[in-house]
Interface confidence: medium
């Protein structure tokens, strides 16, 4: 016997209190699949998060980060502070890369310069805090 709730489309829930009719999701909630017995609360993009896509009755809101921050985690579950190129984020904030390391992005950690001699090459252009060395013949 077919479950009558399976006829309820996305954007509705199957209302058991009303003979399993399909009721529209309340404001600020959604159901992305059919046959649901409740709707889900919309994600709210607050504080350092900002709304990239509004919630609809059939899909959740999507967030990104305000300027000066970038997304981390699945679905932008966290926002992390940007640093300048040549820096990395530590517990004490943005710190310059140590000598011999670089970071060419606003996120991530400082990485060691390439060791040209390992490939039998010499340094053509010296590295900086923002750029890796360029190896030459």
């Amino acid at each position: 016997l077919q479950d009558p709730c399976s006829n309820c489309p996305a954007g509705t829930f199957c209302d058991n209190n009303r003979n399993q009719i399909c009721s529209p999701c309340p404001p600020n909630s959604f159901s992305s699949a059919g046959g649901q017995r409740t709707c889900d609360i919309c994600r709210q993009c607050k504080g350092v998060f900002r709304t990239r896509k509004e919630c609809s009755s059939t899909s959740n809101a999507e967030c990104d980060c305000t300027p000066g921050f970038h997304c981390l985690g699945a679905g932008c579950s966290m926002c992390e502070q940007d640093c300048k190129q040549g820096q990395e984020l530590t517990k004490k904030g943005c710190k310059d890369c140590c000598f011999g390391t670089f970071n060419d992005q606003k996120r991530g950690i400082c990485r060691p310069w390439t060791n040209c001699s390992l490939d039998g090459k010499s340094v053509l252009v010296n590295g900086t805090k923002e750029r890796d060395v360029v190896c030459g013949p």
């Epitope: 309340p26 017995r37 889900d40």
Partner: nanobody, 122 residues
Framework: EVQLLESGGGLVQPGGSLRLSCAAS????????VGWVRQAPGKGLEWVSA????????YYAESVKGRFTISRDNAKNTLYLQMSSLRAEDTAVYYC???????????????RGQGTQVTVSS
């Protein structure tokens, strides 16, 4: 026991106004997310308007924006829907509803009243 009693419906000409009331008992309106749903003849339920986040924000369906205004009187534990510039397509039974948040994040709603009929016709 939770009860919601709607009133204020009637027959009105296109362009006219009505104010619907919903007297609540068994719970405190000001502490809940509440609103209005309607059911037009031969159609499904539709959310019209709601007061959410304990009054922090309001919701209006696109079809009623700028024409309907939701409000509540906490002292009287009553919810209102001021309807103006009414159109034939606003003809429906209007129900007062309370949003219900379930453990685990699910959301449904509850409407217990008989509704109030609004008919817009010349």
């Amino acid at each position: 026991e939770v009860q919601l009693l709607e009133s204020g419906g009637g027959l009105v000409q296109p362009g006219g106004s009505l104010r619907l009331s919903c007297a609540a008992s068994g719970f405190t309106l000001s502490a809940e997310d509440v609103g209005w749903v309607r059911q037009a003849p031969g159609k499904g339920l539709e959310w019209v308007s709601a007061i959410l986040d304990s009054g922090g924000s309001t919701y209006y369906a696109e079809s009623v924006k700028g024409r309907f205004t939701i409000s509540r009187d906490n002292a009287k534990n009553t919810l209102y829907l001021q309807m103006s510039s009414l159109r034939a397509e606003d003809t429906a039974v209007y129900y007062c509803a309370r949003v219900v948040y379930h453990a685990g994040g699910g959301v449904t709603y509850d409407y217990r009243g008989q509704g109030t009929q609004v008919t817009v016709s010349s």
